[in-house]
Amino acid sequence: GSERTCCPVNWVEHERSCYWFSRSGKAWADADNYCRLEDAHLVVVTSWEEQKFVQHHIGPVNTWMGLHDQNGPWKWVDGTDYETGFKNWRPEQPDDWYGHGLGGGEDCAHFTDDGRWNDDVCQRPYRWVCETELDKASQEPPLL
């Protein structure tokens, strides 16, 4: 594929990545799939500066990110190492709370109204943020 050198229309460029901020809500899996269909992934937060950038754009609204523990340990969707990476959980989180009555625990991470992270039921219809890196090979065939 060809290299992407600028962000698609309606995406925001920041530090060699492109971000798209939803204005509607989806379950985590649907949000994840939406980003994949855009040749992107749910946002992966790797630094305090990226945290601030995303926080600035989403405002005080629950918003999915690309972090989950549906298969056991916490994992970032792009393979970024969770254990050694940046974290910004709310106090006492993640807690895998079962008391919501919706079945199971809480396996998907989201930005809360103050920007810090919480784990929640993956079926909740939250907004989401997609991210794709500039300079990576896109799936589009090169123009001949």
């Epitope: 500066e49 601030k52 600035h56 910004n88 106090p91 920007g115 810090r116």
Partner: antibody
Framework: QVQLVESGGGVVQPGRSLRLSCAAS????????MHWVRQAPGKGLEWVAV????????YYADSVKGRFTISRDNSKNTLYLQMNSLRAEDTAVYYC???????????????WGQGTMVTVSS | DIQMTQSPSSVSASVGDRVIITCRAS??????LAWYQQKPGKAPKLLIY???SLQSGVPLRFSGSGSGTDFTLTISSLQPEDFATYYC?????????FGGGTKVEIK
Amino acid sequence: QVQLVESGGGVVQPGRSLRLSCAASGFTFSSYGMHWVRQAPGKGLEWVAVIWYDGSDKYYADSVKGRFTISRDNSKNTLYLQMNSLRAEDTAVYYCARDRLVGATVDAFDIWGQGTMVTVSS
Amino acid sequence: DIQMTQSPSSVSASVGDRVIITCRASQGISIWLAWYQQKPGKAPKLLIYAASSLQSGVPLRFSGSGSGTDFTLTISSLQPEDFATYYCQQAKSFPLTFGGGTKVEIK
């Protein structure tokens, strides 16, 4: 009301140590990153250090790295600055300041203490 | 380190004047710039964050603009209580750095 009150300043000889404290009230201290900023007499502002809301990370200005240690006790709503191997150029008013944003990020300083004077002189 | 350069270092103005202070970063800092006002013997006060967002309680005569490397603080109509020193500060990367300050004096 939201308030920060520094204490612990004074006159100290070069090479000696001093610990500053900053007592916070009127807000959820454990949610905010906290900073120390200093201002030498007649000079501008210089950022010294920051500590994340939960104490998990700390960053320092090069001028104090290895000599100063920032810490916090969220159960006491108090921020500290341990200053070792003090030099004449550390003479300044030291302010503690709250970050505008909660959590593990840094932006602007929206709440400031009144400052405490540290004089390093023989 | 990111250097922040403010200009002018001082400005003489009269009540009612429009005052513009500029701040230039040595490298791009996106919108991560704040402006403060400081009066003698007092702690600084936050005026503007994220380059153009007005801090709660700050009069509307203060405004900020810019992104990347060039930023401005504008006081649309100078009031007697605005005579003070103004500082910019970048929050893009550590170490956080301030500009050298701009003193707004009475003409």
